[in-house]
Amino acid sequence: MAVTACQGLGFVVSLIGIAGIIAATCMDQWSTQDLYNNPVTAVFNYQGLWRSCVRESSGFTECRGYFTLLGLPAMLQAVRALMIVGIVLGAIGLLVSIFALKCIRIGSMEDSAKANMTLTSGIMFIVSGLCAIAGVSVFANMLVTNFWMSTANMYTGMGGMVQTVQTRYTFGAALFVGWVAGGLTLIGGVMMCIACRGLAPEETNYKAVSYHASGHSVAYKPGGFKASTGFGSNTKNKKIYDGGARTEDEVQSYPSKHDYV
């Protein structure tokens, strides 16, 4: 039960995280005009990864896309790339994790296959989350650098003779959405990796034993027995199998023709 819950929760957390990464990538408010010392200008500027917007005091908002690729700063291109890689990896991870979910049965998929898929999706979520966090952090660092540069310029314009009012930009809502979303995706990925450990059959010192009766050959299957640790009393009536250490919710009931995918 714990493994299923961990896997399910990991999936849901990652799903929310990736939705957040997509939202952050699409948002226009990556950087917003700094209004700390009251509004200096009568317009409010904010910028995203794809376009910049200006909101007039009347509420009228006009946005312009960055219709150039080569003219954009390398850092902005890098942030775009990181966010897109994060989204793509996350989307693939989600797709893989859907099939890996223990509560969903597909044919006669082995636990080991589900464990591998869970691990794969978990790693994908971790990398996706790291990409998003890295992208947002790079952009934030860019903003901090520019903020202090423009602050310095405010007071040192032309040898202090001219004081220029500069528009400074600070962290927009998208950065916080991105950080939180990246963190959630990362956590979801870790949870998936933890769930994978519970799904994967544990290696023991015993190998599966085939018992040959005198008249005919019988191979015992694990499905026919109640899960047991294989230790302690009453072991003589039980066979020790590869991965005999199982929790009750991990007992596999094999799909019949009445089971639905």
């Epitope: 509004p39 009568a42 500027n45 910049s52 007039e56 009347s58 312009r64």
Partner: antibody, heavy 119, light 113 residues
């Protein structure tokens, strides 16, 4: 069509206060900023401040803070500017002007109220 | 505060002539976010309130004759009247509507010979 109606003149004594009104019609009053501008006889224009009728948010020219107070009455679509502690320096024509939607310019102006401060 | 400097004043011309008046701001009125210059031109005829002519430095307000043209960017702006008419007798003000407080130029008085 858009109209901003202001009283023609206001005669007040030095030290007193005056409340100049500006009744708006022909548009949705709460949508646009209302600006106030001062013009002394034979002189240029000075921006006093602006108020957004929807939430009474306002911006003032620092020079007029404490001198002018902008308010609105949404029920009657009227904007008001109260001038306190009047002196002869405050004798001027005061215009209300409706802010444009696309830009920050003043699209429509009232006819102006001549405030005369005299003993 | 942003200082708006207008010249010349007064400006005496003959009807039909092309007129150019300038306005300089102490700081750039160009907003990089939308590449717009927040400069407005108003016309004030004697005994009347000002009337909006041009906003965003070059966008003509609806109903304004096309003989009025605004140009310029950053700190230097120009209002051109292509063929002056007798009814254009007025004071023309430029206004910074980008920085608070909004400030006006001292005006250019257009006189017809």
């Amino acid at each position: 069509q858009v109209q901003l109606q202001q009283p023609g003149t206001e005669l007040v004594k030095p030290g007193a206060s005056v409340k100049v009104s500006c009744k708006a019609s022909g548009y949705t009053f709460t949508t646009y900023w209302m600006h106030w501008v001062k013009q002394r006889p034979g002189q240029g224009l000075e921006w006093i401040g602006r108020i957004r009728p929807s939430d009474s948010d306002s911006n003032y020219n620092q020079k007029f803070k404490g001198k002018a107070t902008l308010t609105v009455d949404k029920s009657s679509d009227t904007a008001y500017m109260q001038l306190n502690s009047l002196t002869s320096e405050d004798s001027a024509v005061y215009y209300c002007a409706m802010g444009a939607y696309f830009s920050n310019s003043f699209a429509y102006w009232g006819q102006g109220t001549l405030v005369t401060v005299s003993a | 505060d942003i200082v708006m400097t207008q010249s010349p004043s007064p400006l005496t011309v003959t009807a039909g002539e092309k007129v150019t008046m300038t306005c300089k701001s102490s700081q750039t009125l160009l907003n990089r976010g939308n590449q717009k210059n927040y400069l407005t031109w108003y016309q004030q005829k004697p005994g009347q309130p000002p009337k909006l002519l041009i906003y965003w430095a070059s966008t003509r307000e609806s109903g304004v004759p096309d003989r009025f043209t605004g140009s310029g960017s950053g700190t230097d702006f120009t209002l051109t009247i292509n063929s002056v008419q007798a009814e254009d007798l007025a004071v023309y003000y430029c206004q910074n509507d980008y920085f608070f407080p909004f400030t006006f130029g001292s005006g250019t008085k257009l006189e017809i010979r």
